[in-house]
Amino acid sequence: SEVEYRAEVGQNAYLPCFYTPAAPGNLVPVCWGKGACPVFECGNVVLRTDERDVNYWTSRYWLNGDFRKGDVSLTIENVTLADSGIYCCRIQIPGIMNDEKFNLKLVIKPAKVTPAPTRQRDFTAAFPRMLTTRGHGPAETQTLGSLPDINLTQISTLANELRDSRLANDLRDSGATIRIG
């Protein structure tokens, strides 16, 4: 089941997703899509990273966190009711069926009052429960094009109320991550 996050119309929504690169420079491609994670890739891709960059995005979607250290949390700017729905964060670990997929449900509520202009980091998110998954031993190590050699040792995500980016970093540093390598 999806973890639920909430934001009001006109605010920025924040959907957390983290992993830990195996080594400096060894980034894993990540895609974000609107809709539940399919078997492969992301449907309706809104943002994508490769082994070094954000290499595709659509307007209003960006990574405000330290994505080169594995904070691939998605910010959606100035949300509307139409932004409600399920979003997929997919960590594209090389190897057959190694990808880690996270479905996050975004609920947009009408603004109670006319919102004042918000700073880019403003968001309101609710995280009602914790979801934890464990990897079953190391994944097969494969090399894919110019991607690094990686293996999967631990997978976990934490859903907890995030007040600001500093807390997001604290959570990541305390183990709210997918660890690779």
Epitope: P24, G25, E51, R52, D53, V54, N55, W57, S59, W62, L63, N64, G65, D66, F67, R68, T75, E77, Q120, T143, G145, S146, L147, P148
Partner: antibody, heavy 120, light 107 residues
Framework: QVQLVQSGAEVKKPGASVKVSCKAS????????MDWVRQAPGQGLEWLGY????????SYNQKFKGRVTMTTDKSTSTAYMELRSLRSDDTAVYYC?????????????WGQGTTVTVSS | DIVMTQSQKFMSTSVGDRVSITCKAS??????VAWYQQKPGQSPKLLIY???NRYTGVPDRFTGSGSGTDFTLTISNMQSEDLADYFC?????????FGGGTKLEIK
Amino acid sequence: QVQLVQSGAEVKKPGASVKVSCKASGYTFTDYYMDWVRQAPGQGLEWLGYIYPNKGGTSYNQKFKGRVTMTTDKSTSTAYMELRSLRSDDTAVYYCARGGYYSYYSYDYWGQGTTVTVSS
Amino acid sequence: DIVMTQSQKFMSTSVGDRVSITCKASQSVGNNVAWYQQKPGQSPKLLIYYASNRYTGVPDRFTGSGSGTDFTLTISNMQSEDLADYFCQQHYSSPYTFGGGTKLEIK
């Protein structure tokens, strides 16, 4: 200490190709990206692309796609940038620059620059 | 492509001044901005990476700030050796793009 030493100045005719080299020393060549940046006379800086020597992966600025090729020779820790079908507006100083993960792929070391003049 | 705009091409300063050079991105780039200093006939030198991290050996009078779309390089106590061109660069997404540069001159 880290050093990036580039090849000497080149004068080329329009339509020709140029290949600039950048020899790295003082660090593990395969652990860092090598980017190429150019600067036309009196102008700003323009990114051409990068190569990751460890895996050979490249990414080029679309503006130069089809005209630029970046390669490395790991045995000599040397990066190369070839630009083809030269035009007069390719006249510039070409720099290699090391993209470090710890500096978030900003450029902590630069070569001294290679002046490429395109003139008929 | 993400456009980086340095609106001030030239700035007149005096030794001891506090100088702020601004750079605006056409879309959010998080904190993925670097600042470089370039003196005539020399290669650029890295001053600030990831918006606010001072590179090794850079004097502490240089400070970077900002995130999202608006970034500032501040020189708190201008020295004669700081007369140079200053460029911002986004390294959020390729093609990496640079601002047009700001040249510091003496009044």
